[in-house]
Interface confidence: medium
C-alpha cells in the first residue's frame, strides 16, 4: 500500500491503477474511514456520497475537501483492458499546519539559583497534535526535571478536532551576568515539513542578591484613624519572585492568607496595636519589616504615633 498525506481542507485525488482512462470501466472503490462504520463501497453512478468522495470519469477518486474523518484506508479494484485485475491500496493521513507558535507571558529577567518561569509556548490549530520543543541559544533544550522543567498540555477543539499545545518552561540558571536566548519550535513530525519557530526572547540573568529593604506603608499616614474608618497596610518589597507575606500584630501572627496588603475595614479599638509584615523569600528566609503603630481615636489630628510611618503614606506595588 501507499501512504498519502493530505492537507485538511484541500482536495485529494487517488488514482485507480489499471483502470481504463474512460468508460466502459470495471472498477470498485471501497473505503474504511472515520466517516464509515466498516468498509463502504462507492458506486460509479454517484449518490449521496458525492459531496464527500466521488469517482471521476477516469476512475480516480476525488475527495473535494479532506477532513480528519477522511483518514483511513482507500482501495480500488479495477479490471484492465486485458482483463487482468489490478488493486490499488492507499493509507490516507491528514494534517493541518498551525499558526506560528508564540511565547506568551515571557519573563522580563531571570534570577540565578532559583526556579524561573521563562514563558509559555502556545501553538494553535495543528493536526495531528505535533510537538513543541524549547531551544536555548539555538540548541535543543532537554528537560531534566531539575534545572530544566517543562509542563505540557494538549487540548483538542471539540468541533474542529484541531489541537492546541501549551508548553511552560521553567529553568534554574546557574550563574548571573549571562543573557540566554530562548525560542520554541513546533513540529508536526511529517517528512519534508520544517519546524515553525517562535521569535526568540533574550533574558538577563541576575544574581539573587538579598531582597532590598522591606517597607511597611500605612494609610492613613501616621496610623491614626477614627473609629469605623479603614486602615491599609502595604508590605513593599522589591524581590523576585515575589515573596509570601504574613502579618504580625503585637508579636503574634495574624490568622490570614498570605498577602502583601492588610486591610482593616471598620476599625475599632480592638485593632489598635503594633503591626509588622514578614516576607519569606525562597532563597533568603524570612525578613521582617519595621513595625507601625495603629491608633484609633475620635479625632484624627494628634500627629503621628510613636513608631509609626510618617512621610511615606501608601506607595504602589508593582
Amino acid at each position: 500500500g501507499q501512504n498519502i498525506t493530505a492537507r485538511i481542507g484541500e482536495p485529494l485525488v487517488l488514482s485507480c491503477k489499471g483502470a481504463p482512462k474512460k468508460p466502459p470501466q470495471q472498477l470498485e472503490w471501497k473505503l474504511n474511514t472515520g466517516r464509515t462504520e466498516a468498509w463502504k463501497v462507492l458506486s460509479p453512478q454517484g449518490g449521496p456520497w458525492d459531496s464527500v468522495a466521488r469517482i471521476l470519469p477516469n476512475g480516480s477518486l476525488l475527495l473535494p475537501a479532506t477532513g480528519i474523518v477522511d483518514e483511513g484506508t482507500f482501495r480500488c479494484r479495477a479490471t484492465n483492458r486485458r482483463g487482468k485485475e489490478v488493486k490499488s491500496n492507499y493509507r490516507v493521513r491528514v494534517y493541518q499546519i498551525p499558526g506560528k507558535p508564540e511565547i506568551v507571558d515571557p519573563a522580563s529577567e531571570l534570577t540565578a539559583s532559583v526556579p524561573n518561569k521563562v514563558g509559555t509556548c502556545v501553538s494553535e490549530g495543528s493536526y495531528p497534535a505535533g510537538t513543541l520543543s524549547w531551544h536555548l541559544d539555538g540548541k535543543l533544550l532537554i528537560p531534566d526535571g531539575k534545572e530544566t522543567l517543562v509542563k505540557e498540555e494538549t487540548r483538542r477543539h471539540p468541533e474542529t478536532g484541531l489541537f492546541t499545545l501549551r508548553s511552560e518552561l521553567t529553568v534554574i540558571p546557574t550563574q548571573g551576568g549571562t543573557h540566554p536566548t530562548f525560542s520554541c519550535s513546533f513540529s508536526l513530525g511529517l517528512p519534508r515539513r520544517r519546524p515553525l519557530n517562535t521569535a526568540p526572547i533574550q533574558l538577563r540573568v541576575r544574581e539573587p542578591g538579598p531582597p532590598e529593604g522591606i517597607q511597611l506603608l500605612v494609610e492613613p499616614e501616621g496610623g491614626i484613624v477614627a473609629p469605623g474608618g479603614t486602615v491599609t497596610l502595604t508590605c513593599a518589597i522589591s524581590a523576585q519572585p515575589p515573596p509570601q507575606v504574613h502579618w504580625i500584630k503585637d508579636g503574634a501572627p495574624l490568622p490570614l492568607a498570605p498577602s502583601p496588603v492588610l486591610l482593616l475595614p471598620e476599625v475599632g479599638h480592638e485593632d489598635e496595636g503594633t503591626y509588622s509584615c514578614v516576607a519569606t523569600h525562597p532563597s533568603h528566609g524570612p525578613q521582617e519589616s519595621p513595625p507601625v503603630s495603629i491608633r484609633v481615636t475620635e479625632t484624627g489630628d494628634e500627629g503621628p504615633a510613636e513608631g509609626s510611618v510618617g512621610e511615606s503614606g501608601l506607595g504602589t506595588l508593582a
Epitope: P258, L263, E266
Partner: antibody, heavy 117, light 109 residues
Framework: QVQLQQSGAELVRPGTSVKVSCKAS????????IDWVNQRPGQGLEWIGV????????NYNEKFTGKATLTADKSSSTAYMQLSSLTSDDSAVYFC??????????WGQGTSVTVSS | QAVVTQESALTTSPGETVTLTCRSS?????????ANWVQEKPDHLFTGLIG???NRAPGVPARFSGSLIGDKAALTITGAQTEDEAIYFC?????????FGGGTKLTVL
C-alpha cells in the same frame, strides 16, 4: 445588609468534581477574607481554607490541599471552592464565611454536596 | 493536629448567666489562638458571635462576651434568653489553620 448566598445542593458521582459558589453582597468584597468550612453528617465543623479576594492569596488546611481549590472573582463578588476526585467521604454541607482579620462574622446558608454512584 | 474540646451539653434558665468553655489539647489557650465563637440554629443557620478572643461581631447582642478563663477560651451569656438555645462552636487558630471544637448544645428551659 451583608449576605453570602451559596449555590444549590449538588448530587455528584464519585471521581468527578464540583464547584460551589458564594456570592457576597452588602459590603466591599475585597476588604474581607472568605473562609470555607464543612460539616459532615452528624459531625462537627472542619476548616478547609481561606482566600483573600483582594490579592488571591490562599491558605489551606493540609488535609484539603489537592482536594479543594479556592478562587475569587472580584468583578462578581463571588468566591468559589472546587472539590476534585470526589469520594463518599466528601459528602457534607459546605459553608463560606466572611472574616474580618480574626472574626468570622457572616456565614452562607450552606451547600449540600452528596457523592453517590 | 490539635484537638479542641467543648462541653457536649449545658442547660440554663432564662435570665441566668451561663459560661461555655473551649480547651486546647496543646496547652493553654492564648490570645494568639484568636478564639472564635459561632452559633448554629436549626437548618444550618450559622452566625459568628465572637472573634479574636473577645471582639463581638457586628449586630451581636451585648449579653454575649468572650474571654480567657484560666487555660481555656470562654463564651459567657449574661441573662440567657430562650432564643439563645442553639449549638455553639468554638474555633482556635494554630499558626496556619483553624480547628473547631465539637460544639456545645445549649438548652434554655
Amino acid at each position: 445588609q451583608v449576605q453570602l448566598q451559596q449555590s444549590g445542593a449538588e448530587l455528584v458521582r464519585p471521581g468527578t468534581s464540583v464547584k460551589v459558589s458564594c456570592k457576597a453582597s452588602g459590603y466591599a468584597f475585597t476588604n474581607y477574607l472568605i473562609d470555607w468550612v464543612n460539616q459532615r453528617p452528624g459531625q462537627g465543623l472542619e476548616w478547609i481554607g481561606v482566600i483573600n479576594p483582594g490579592s488571591g492569596g490562599t491558605n489551606y488546611n493540609e488535609k484539603f490541599t489537592g482536594k479543594a481549590t479556592l478562587t475569587a472573582d472580584k468583578s462578581s463578588s463571588t468566591a468559589y471552592m472546587q472539590l476534585s476526585s470526589l469520594t463518599s467521604d466528601d459528602s457534607a454541607v459546605y459553608f463560606c464565611a466572611r472574616r474580618r482579620v480574626d472574626t468570622m462574622d457572616y456565614w452562607g446558608q450552606g451547600t449540600s454536596v452528596t457523592v453517590s454512584s | 493536629q490539635a484537638v479542641v474540646t467543648q462541653e457536649s451539653a449545658l442547660t440554663t434558665s432564662p435570665g441566668e448567666t451561663v459560661t461555655l468553655t473551649c480547651r486546647s489539647s496543646t496547652g493553654a489557650v492564648t490570645t494568639s489562638n484568636y478564639a472564635n465563637w459561632v452559633q448554629e440554629k436549626p437548618d444550618h443557620l450559622f452566625t459568628g458571635l465572637i472573634g479574636g478572643t473577645n471582639n463581638r461581631a457586628p449586630g451581636v447582642p451585648a449579653r454575649f462576651s468572650g474571654s480567657l478563663i484560666g487555660d481555656k477560651a470562654a463564651l459567657t451569656i449574661t441573662g440567657a434568653q430562650t432564643e439563645d438555645e442553639a449549638i455553639y462552636f468554638c474555633a482556635l487558630w494554630y499558626s496556619n489553620h483553624w480547628v473547631f471544637g465539637g460544639g456545645t448544645k445549649l438548652t434554655v428551659l
